[in-house]
């Protein structure tokens, strides 16, 4: 009973494997929010090139729950949020910061998906006594992928198959935890 | 596509050990938890347990402790049941599913029929 | 561990009509029920999560409610294809059980 005064506004779904959020409204509780970040591509000259490993993105950090029916992660997850129009990667974060958008003309390039993790998070469920987790796959980095006029949403479609088939050997490997292990910590958590 | 492919039927002798696979396709077996389920003839669905393939962790139901051994192999995407000192009693369809939680069932196989001869 | 007692045992119906099963938990388990369906000489295939939650690609008539003890899974108009066995199953505490389940036959 006691549940919907735990549970606030700002828990938020995690999308399950395939779907991947436009970027989220402000969330109450978040910590290191919105840090903008270039996606570690080394810088060009801004206008002398059009190949898309020349631009760069925004890879917004928010701050949430996840949530499964009732249940609510014990501790909020960060997922990353690809976000912005892309622009070459020198002039991007000094564009950002004078509040100026570099559009490309001709091809749209769009910031999607590159890269994603999964992550195992402990859930509490109200009146439950099993030890729950839950797998939950985040994006790990943001990548520009040039679409064109004529393919514009096949393209933006087609990355809920790729994250479907996630290359392997891409998350950082906890060491082995037996399940007695989590249902300790689950219990402390209540 | 999400997909578990299950090993084919065993036919086995009373007091041998079978071990059975599950092979997922269009995703890492290592981002879910692979349960088993065993369906004996005209009767209902029984929990055995659950495997956490990325590291081993496991939980099964009191029922199948010392029956039951889950394993799993990250390299070839495979979840793997051994069942040993089989009787008639463990004649039935064992399932394997994959579930983002491991407390209910997305994702299921197609099932391995067991059938166990004395 | 923690029974679920399905009930009735055979339904029959006739397509287009509402149709209900009924799960009750031998104690109180918040929602946390989940509903499955098997087809004859298929796989179990997740209906509805914790009580009344629908599932991707599911078809809207299936609908589920309840809480505590007792729970009802519905189907608002039959078809043809709905004919399986339905199987509830907690999650509240380990291990996860199921119910017996039951079998919707046409008449």
């Known amino acids: 009973q006691g549940w919907q005064a735990f549970k606030n506004d700002a828990t938020e779904i995690i999308p399950e494997l395939g779907e991947y959020p436009e970027p989220p409204p402000e969330l109450e509780n978040n910590k290191t929010m919105n840090r903008a970040e270039n996606g570690g591509r080394p810088p060009h000259h801004p206008f002398e090139t059009k190949d898309v490993s020349e631009y760069s993105c925004r890879e917004l950090h928010f701050t949430r729950y996840v949530t499964d029916g009732p249940c609510r992660s014990a501790k909020p997850v960060t997922e990353l949020v690809c976000s912005g129009q892309c622009g070459p990667a020198r002039l991007l974060p000094n564009a950002i910061g004078r509040g100026k958008w570099w559009r490309p003309s001709g091809p749209d390039f769009r910031c999607i998906p590159d890269r994603y993790r999964a992550q195992r998070v402990q859930l509490l469920c109200p009146g439950g006594e099993a030890p729950r987790a839950r797998k939950v796959r985040l994006v790990a980095s943001c990548k520009c992928k040039r679409l064109t006029r004529f393919h514009n949403q096949s393209e933006l479609k087609d990355f809920g198959t790729e994250a479907a088939r996630p290359q392997k050997g891409r998350k950082p490997r906890p060491r082995a935890r037996s399940a007695k292990a989590n249902q300790a910590e689950l219990e402390n958590a209540y | 596509e999400v997909q578990l492919q299950q090993s084919g039927a065993e036919l086995v002798r009373s007091g041998a050990s079978v071990k059975l696979s599950c092979t997922a396709s269009?995703?890492?077996?290592?981002?879910?938890?692979v349960h088993w389920v065993k369906q004996r003839p005209e009767q209902g669905l029984e929990w055995i347990g659950w495997i956490d393939p990325e590291n081993g962790d496991t939980e099964y139901a009191p029922k199948f402790q010392g029956k039951a051994t889950m394993t799993a192999d990250t390299s070839s995407n495979t979840a793997y049941l051994q069942l040993s000192s089989l009787t008639s009693e463990d004649t039935a369809v064992y399932y394997c599913?994959?579930?983002?939680?491991?407390?209910?069932?997305?994702?299921w196989g197609q099932g391995t029929t067991v059938t166990v001869s004395s | 561990d923690i029974l679920l007692t399905q009930s009735p045992a055979i339904l029959s119906v006739s397509p287009g009509e509402r149709v209900s099963f009924s799960c009750r938990a031998s104690q109180s388990i918040g929602t946390n029920i989940h509903w499955y369906q098997q087809r004859t000489d298929g796989s179990p295939r997740l209906l509805i999560k914790f009580a009344s939650e629908s599932i991707s690609g599911i078809p809207s008539r299936f609908s589920g409610s309840g809480s505590g003890t007792d729970f009802t899974l519905s189907i608002n108009s039959v078809e043809s294809e709905d004919i399986a066995d339905y199987y509830c199953?907690?999650?509240?505490?380990?291990?996860?059980?199921f119910g017996a389940g039951t079998k919707l036959e046409l008449k």
């Open positions: 199953q907690q999650s509240n505490s380990w291990p996860l059980t």
């Open positions: 269009g995703f890492n077996i290592e981002d879910y938890y």
């Open positions: 599913n994959g579930g983002y939680g491991n407390f209910y069932f997305d994702y």
